[in-house]
Amino acid sequence: VMEMQWCTISDPEQQKCKDMSKAFQGAGIQPSLLCVQGTSTDHCVQLIKDQKADAITLDGGAIYQAGKEYGLKPVVGEVYDQDIGTSYYAVAVVRRNSNVTINTLKGVKSCHTGINRTVGWNVPVGYLVETGHLSVMGCDVLKAVGDYFGGSCVPGAGETSHSESLCRLCRGDSSGHNVCDKSPLERYYDYSGAFRCLAEGAGDVAFVKHSTVLENTDGKTLPSWGKALMSQDFQLLCRDGSRADITEWRRCHLAKVPAHAVVVRDDMDGGLIFRLLNEGQLLFSHEDSSFQMFSSKAYGQKNLLFKDSTLELVPIATQNYESWLGQEYLHAMKGLLCDPNRLPHYLRWCVLSVPEIQKCGDMAVAFSRQSLKPEIQCVSAESPEHCMQQIQAGHIDAVTLRGEDIYRAGKAYGLVPAAGELYAEEDRSNSYFVVAVVRRDSSYSFTLDELRSKRSCHPGLGSPAGWEVPIGSLIQRGFIRPKDCDVLTAVSEFFNASCVPVNNPKNYPSSLCALCVGDEKGRNKCVGSSQERYYGYSGAFRCLVENAGDVAFLKHTTVFENTNGHNPEPWASHLRWQDYELLCPNGARAEVDQFQACNLAQMPSHAVMVHPDTNIFTVYGLLDKAQDLFGDDHNKNGFQMFDSSKYHSQDLLFKDATVRAVPVREKTTYLDWLGPDYVVALEGMLSQQC
C-alpha cells in the first residue's frame, strides 16, 4: 500500500489531517497519508465502502452502523484512561435520599448530557427501549422520551418539535439565554452539566459517565456549584432494579461504552493502519511536539480526527464491530435503530378466519383514526403455518401465536417474538406452572425419576399441563421411549395404571383408563367430560386424593383451588394443601407453594411473531400506544383490542384474556420466550410425530 486515505468531515478536520500528513511525511512514516474530504460520518463510511477513502475514526453508534450495514471493521482503538482501557461506562445517577430505581423511571425528571450523545442519550434511551421500559411508536424517539419522563433537560433538543418536555428542566446561561443549547452556554450541558441538573434538584436522574460524580464532588477542583457536594450522597441505578454506591460502576451501569475506533474496509490490513498511527503517536502525542495528534485547540474545535482525551492508540485484536462494541452497548444500540425514513407505512397482520378479518379491519380503522403508526393492513392466510411462511417470505409482517406454533415459527421459519401477551395475575387458565403433585407420605416416597410403574392421574388426553408437558418431558428425558411413535402405548406401559380421560377413543390403551371411575353410577368411565369424576384438573387431583393414583399432573393452582375450604364438595372439603408435595426435576420434593422453583415447565403466553429483520420495538411501540386507547374492554374509543365477543367468537388477533401487550425484554428468540423446560417437553412430543 503506497498511500492511506483518511476521510474528514469538516474544514477544520481537513486542515488538521493535512498537517498530520505533513508531519508524518517529514518523519518518514510510511505509507503516506492523504486526506479525503467528506461531508459527514455517513458520507465518509460510504466513501470507504466505495474505495474512495480508507479510514475514519468513529464513535460507537457509527461503528455499529458502519459494521452492520457496510461491513467495515474497527482496527485501532483510543484509550482515555489507563485504568479502564478502551472503554468507559454509562451510568444513571440518583440522589441517595430518593427511591427511584431503573424500573420506576416513568414520570421521573431526567438530566442528559445532550441530544444524540452516547452516555447522555443513546445508551440510556436505547437501553430503556431495548428492555421494554420505554415504547416508541413510529420511530418517534423524541416524543416517546418526552412522554416517558416527567420533564427533561436534553441540550440540543430545542430545535425539535418536542422541546417543551425535553427542554423543560434546562436553565440556559446566567442571564437565562441559550436555554437547551447544545453548548456550554446551557448550564446543564455535558457530563458535569447533567450532574449539576441532578445535584441542584432540577432532575431526579442524570445519565452521565462513570467518572462524572467523582470528578464533581468531594471538594476537588470544582466549579462553585459543586463545592459542597459529597459523592456518598448519590447512588447508581443498576439494571437489576437495585442501587449501588458511586464507586460500584464496574458492576452497576447501563452499558460499557466502547472507545472511538478507526474503521477500515474488511479487506484492509488492520496491522498496517496501526503501524502507521503508532509511529505517529510515538512522535506526535506530546505537548512539546511540533504536531499534536490528540489536540484540536490549534483549529478552534474539539475532537478532530481523534478525541482530545485520547492518551494512546492501541491495536484491536478481534476486528469485528460486535466484539469491539460489546453486548451491553449493542443491546442499547438495538433499541435506537429506528429510522423514521425507513419505517414501513404498513404493518401487515396475518388473519385466519372471517371473524378475525372483521376484527382486524376494525382495528386498522381504529388505529388509523388515532394516527397510530405504522398503519395496520390485514392479510388472510389459511393456517398459522401459512402465516409463518408468508412472514418468512416478507409478504406479511406479524401474527400472534401460541406456544407450539411459536416453536415452529422460530425453528422452521426463523421468526422472532416482538411482543407478548400478559394475563391477569389471578388468571390461571392462561398463565401457569405445570406441576407433579404427590401425597406427603414419608413411608412411600419417590422422585420424578422414579415414576415408572406408579399410578398417574391426568386431566385429559392432550391437556397442556396434564399430558403434553409431563409426557413430553418424560420422553425427552428418556424415561418413556415410544416405539413407532406410539406415545399412548408407551405411556400405558410406563405407568402401572392411569386415568387419562379421552373423547372418542380409538384403539385407546385400557390402562390409561384403568384408574378412571366414571359417574356416580359407574357409567361414562374415562370420558373426556365432567361425567368422569376424575376428568379435568380438579378431577385429576381428586384421583390422587382418593388414592387411585400416586401422582397427578396439574396446574400449580389446582391444589389450592381444592383445599383449605376452597372447594366445598364432599371429596375436597376436608383437604389441606400442606398434605401434598411437588416433585421437582432435580429429584427433590417441595411444598406446593414452591411451584416457581419446583415445576415441570411454565406455560408460555402467546407472542406476536415477526421476521427477524422487522424492528420489534416499532411493533411493540404501536401495540403499547394502541392499548392505552383500546386495551381496556370497557374503553369508549370504539374498539376493544382484547375482546372478541362483538364478533361472536373468541381470541381473535389476541387472546381475550390478555390484559396488556408486553415487551419481550431479554426474551428475543423463540427459545428464550418459550423457556427451556417447555421446549424440552415440546420437543419430546414433537419427536413422536411420525
Partner: antibody, heavy 118, light 107 residues
C-alpha cells in the same frame, strides 16, 4: 357394518409356512388396529399380536414373535398373518379381529382353520 | 403375563334362570375385563368391557361386575340362544389373555 372376511381353510405339511388373509370392509381400514387370535382345543384363546394398518407398526405376544409375522396392504384393506415353521401344535382356528374404542379385539372375523399334518 | 382363570368349565341352567359366571385374575386388572360369548360354529362376540360396560346391541339381561381380581358375568334370565362358550379377557396389559372358557348348557 364392520366385516372381516378371512381366507379359507389350509392344510399344510410340518415345516412349511402359510399366509392367512383378512379383508376388512364397512369402516376406514387405517383407523383401527387389527388383532390376531389363536383358538385351539388345548389352550382356548391366545392373543398373537396386533398391527396398526396406518403405519404397519406391530406388537407381538412374546410366545408368538418367532412364529407369526403381521403385515397389511392398505390399498386392498387387507391384513395378513404369516405363520412359519409349522408343527402340529399350530393346528388351530385363527381369527383376525378389529379393535374398537379400546385397544383389544371387538369385532371378529369368521376364522381360518389351519391343519398341520404330514 | 396375567393369568385369567374361569374355575367352571361347564355350567348347567334352565331357560329363565339367573346365572353367574366367574373369572379371577392373577393380579389387579383395574376392572379392565371383557366378556365374550361364542356360539357353536361362530366366532367370539364382545358382550362387556370395563367389567360392566355393555357393548352396543347387547341385551340388558347381560350385566358385568367386579373389581380388583374378581369378576362376574350375570345373565338375569337365560334364553335358549344364550347357549354358548363364555370367555373373560383382561384388557389391562398386553399380552391380552383369556380365561379357559365356561360352557353354558341348557338343561
Amino acid at each position: 357394518e364392520v366385516q372381516l372376511q378371512q381366507s379359507g381353510p389350509e392344510l399344510v405339511k410340518p415345516g412349511a409356512s402359510v399366509k392367512i388373509s383378512c379383508k376388512a370392509s364397512g369402516y376406514s381400514f387405517t383407523d383401527y388396529y387389527l388383532h390376531w387370535v389363536k383358538q385351539s382345543h388345548v389352550k382356548s384363546l391366545e392373543w398373537i399380536g396386533r398391527i396398526n394398518p396406518y403405519n404397519g407398526a406391530t406388537s407381538y405376544n412374546q410366545i408368538f414373535k418367532d412364529k407369526a409375522s403381521l403385515t397389511v396392504d392398505k390399498s386392498s384393506s387387507t391384513a395378513y398373518m404369516d405363520l412359519h415353521s409349522l408343527t402340529s401344535e399350530d393346528s388351530a382356528v385363527y381369527y383376525c379381529a378389529r379393535g374398537g374404542d379400546y385397544d383389544f379385539p371387538w369385532y371378529w372375523g369368521q376364522g381360518t382353520t389351519l391343519t398341520v399334518s404330514p | 403375563d396375567i393369568v385369567m382363570t374361569q374355575s367352571h368349565k361347564f355350567m348347567s341352567t334352565s331357560v329363565g334362570d339367573r346365572v353367574s359366571i366367574t373369572c379371577k385374575a392373577s393380579q389387579d386388572v383395574y376392572a379392565a375385563v371383557a366378556w365374550y360369548h361364542q356360539k357353536p360354529g361362530q366366532s367370539p362376540k364382545l358382550l362387556i368391557y370395563w367389567a360392566s360396560t355393555r357393548h352396543a346391541g347387547v341385551p340388558d339381561r347381560f350385566t358385568g361386575s367386579g373389581s380388583g381380581t374378581d369378576y362376574t358375568l350375570t345373565i338375569s334370565s337365560v334364553q335358549a340362544e344364550d347357549l354358548a362358550l363364555y370367555y373373560c379377557q383382561q384388557h389391562y396389559r398386553t399380552p391380552w389373555t383369556f380365561g379357559g372358557g365356561t360352557k353354558l348348557e341348557i338343561k
